[in-house]
């Protein structure tokens, strides 16, 4: 067991051009706080994956208000260290994420608003008990300077905090097989304390609290003899009594992973994959509960009432992320239908609708013809959010109120002459053409491409089609 300690030295604009604007203003004073997330090994994991080694939040820093016109200085920091306790062995290699959060103290809807200013991540090797390691990380135009170390909590010592030390029982020497504890030379390495109840005959341990079984024995306390009847999953050496292979002790026997963690064997031991909200060698430690207030920006914490259950955050519309820390551009979801313009007002979403559409999301196609009369026998036709009138012969305009000149569009083909008539129009065709619009040529022999003209009309006569 031990503690990882993080000391933030400064957070401010990095060197070079493009200095960031101050995150605070006279209108929106703010203060900073930090979150650290630790994971074992050198894994390149997503920021949202569980902080299996632990996580910590700093206190809030002093309130800061930007001086108008001044460049963003190093911002005032919270007091004290960020401390992440670990119960089991220090892994030696670890990944970290350090987040800088801004708490806006202006007149926010629903109280203060939190937003992520910068996130840095890295992978490091670190022995417990060593000196402070200094680091500088950049995130965009921001620069974070910090130091960190891992230290063991007594009685644990060593680079992994797995050796235990006890005061010497005799002034001159340690007990048989036990070495002095460096750097505490006046203390002796203590024998490992295995899991309570671990069989002294059939079990042993390489780390405190562990119980690993000798060949032929199984169970969490190594008290159960391995059945030799089936020999279905041979793992150990041949048994002299049965002539078949006896399963040896598997590190995942009895599933050492708590809280629904799944166990997988590794070359030297086992590894637990923990469900969200748990960490530790055996998933026995819960990182955060709802009581810690992990949901930002008005998020509601669901579950996680006690250290044995994981929490999730239900985020208000407009926020997402495992802690509701990310603002969503709600207009990117294109909520306004029928070409409406989307406006995200923060407290609400508004759609400005095109003509002919209405409703909160412009979902209603207005009845364009409702209350619209087309004059002079015209009929109303809906379409595309506007209405138009299909006018009776001889009328035109938006509402069919204008008397139309039927000859304005030059409807008579092949040089025919147009005459306006009370019932429409009449074409007087040029020689050699016939039809209502003079569209048909008359054949040279007097026959036409149409059936014979009605009696009383010669080809070439003006033809009236009513």
């Amino acid at each position: 067991a031990g503690v990882f300690e993080l000391q933030i030295h400064s957070f401010g604009p990095g060197p070079g051009p493009g200095a960031p604007r101050s995150p605070c203003s006279a209108r929106l004073p703010c203060r900073l706080f930090f979150r650290v997330c630790l994971k074992p090994g050198l894994s390149e994991e997503a920021a949202e994956s569980p902080c299996a080694l632990g996580a910590a939040l700093s206190a809030r820093g002093p309130v800061y208000t930007e001086q108008p016109g001044a460049p963003a200085p190093d911002l005032p920091l919270p007091d004290g260290l960020l401390q992440v306790p670990f119960r089991d062995a220090w892994p030696g290699t670890f990944s970290f994420i350090i987040e800088t959060w801004r708490e806006e103290l202006g007149d926010q809807i629903g109280g203060p608003a939190w937003s992520l200013l910068a996130r840095v991540a890295g992978r490091r090797r670190l022995a417990a008990g060593g000196p402070w390691a200094r680091d500088i990380q950049r995130a965009g135009a921001w620069e974070l300077r910090f130091s960190y170390r891992a230290r063991c909590e007594p009685p644990a010592v060593g680079t992994a905090c797995t050796r235990l030390c006890r005061p010497r029982s005799a002034p001159s020497r340690c007990g048989p097989g036990l070495r002095p504890c460096a750097p505490l030379e006046d203390e002796c390495e203590a024998p490992l304390v295995c899991r309570a109840g671990c069989s002294p005959e059939h079990g042993f341990c390489e780390q405190p609290g562990e119980c690993r079984c000798l060949e032929g024995w199984t169970g969490p306390l190594c008290t159960v003899p391995v059945s030799t009847s089936s020999c279905l999953s041979p793992r150990g050496p041949s048994s002299a009594t049965t002539g078949c292979l006896v399963p040896g002790p598997g590190p995942c026997d009895g599933n050492p992973c708590a809280n629904g963690g799944s166990c997988s064997e590794t070359p030297r031991s086992f590894e637990c994959t923990c469900p969200r909200g748990f960490y530790g060698l055996r998933c026995e430690v819960s990182g955060v509960t709802c009581a810690d207030g992990p949901c930002f920006n008005g998020g509601l914490c669901v579950g996680g009432a006690d250290p044995d259950s994981a929490y999730i955050c239900h985020c208000p519309p407009g926020f997402q992320g495992s802690n509701c820390e990310k603002r969503v551009d709600r207009c990117s979801l294109q909520p306004c239908r029928n070409g409406g313009l989307c406006l995200d007002l923060g407290h609400a979403l508004r759609c400005r609708c095109r003509a002919g559409f209405a409703g909160p999301r412009c979902e209603h196609d207005l009845d364009d013809c409702a209350g619209r009369a087309c004059a002079n026998g015209g009929t109303c036709v809906e379409g595309g959010g506007a209405h138009r009138c299909s006018c009776a012969l001889g009328f035109g305009g938006r509402d069919c109120r204008e008397r139309a000149d039927p000859c304005a569009a030059r409807p008579c083909a092949h040089g025919g002459r147009c005459y306006a008539h009370f019932s429409g129009l009449v074409c007087a065709c040029a020689p050699g053409y016939m039809g209502a619009r003079c569209e048909f040529p008359v054949h040279p022999d007097g026959a036409s491409a149409l059936p014979a003209a009605p009696p009383g009309l010669r080809p070439g006569d003006p033809q009236r089609y009513l």
Partner: antibody, heavy 118, light 108 residues
């Protein structure tokens, strides 16, 4: 202006399922969480559950085994079903909108009294 | 779950007086996520205060909220005749959402 209107039978027999619908006008049901709250006669308010159009639901643990909330975005409505009712479920049932800034109720329906009796 | 206890159960005051209503939580309310509602007979509750101290739209400034952690207060300065009603607090930091039992403000 956002308006919510509850509808459904005012009388339900014991052991049957209580079904109510809330019709929302003036805003899109896809933009907010929508909730049901009830109030037994002469008593205080009890949160039943809420739903978001994405499928997120959350129910009061004391009612979870009997309750279901669903949304119909095409009709801009959401519904409550409460199974195996008893006389203790007699109450005024309110539908409400949860604020965009947090899980408090900024608009309420006028409420509908549901009596459980044979 | 977080249990909210409101006191007093009933408050008898005259118009023009100040009303002070208390809401106490069984455990700390995250980030002061606490709201107050007013309910008149036969009507639905109406939102007054959110975030412990922010007034909702169209709520007169004689209503004010304060507090953090486990202790919250709603104050009504200079009671008007229309302010006599039942008042409920509600926490919205941790599920399940819970209401207090209510305080009735009645005319003395």
């Amino acid at each position: 202006q956002v308006q919510l209107q509850e509808s459904g039978p005012g009388l339900v027999k014991p052991s049957e399922t209580l079904s109510l619908t809330c019709t929302v006008s003036g805003d899109s049901i896809s933009s907010y969480y929508w909730s049901w709250i009830r109030q037994p006669p002469g008593k205080g308010l009890e949160w039943i559950g809420y739903m978001y159009y994405s499928g997120i639901t959350n129910y009061n643990p004391s009612l979870k085994s009997r309750v279901n909330i669903s949304l119909d975005t095409s009709k801009n409505q959401f519904s409550l079903k409460l199974g195996s009712v008893t006389a203790a479920d007699t109450a005024v049932y309110y539908c409400a909108r949860l604020s965009v800034a947090g899980f408090y109720f900024d608009y309420w329906g006028q409420g509908t009294l549901v009596t459980v009796s044979s | 779950e977080i249990v909210l206890t409101q006191s007093p159960g009933t408050l008898s005051l005259s118009p023009g007086e100040r009303a002070t209503l208390s809401c106490r939580a069984s455990q700390s309310v995250t980030r002061s996520y606490l709201a107050w509602y007013q309910q008149k007979p036969g009507q639905a509750p109406r939102l007054l205060i959110y975030g412990a101290s922010s007034r909702a739209t169209d709520i007169p400034d004689r209503f004010s909220g304060s507090g953090s952690g486990t202790d919250f207060t709603l104050t009504i300065n200079r009671l008007e005749p229309e302010d006599f009603a039942v008042y409920y607090c509600q926490q919205y930091g941790t599920s399940p959402l819970t209401f207090g039992g209510g305080t009735k403000v009645e005319i003395k």
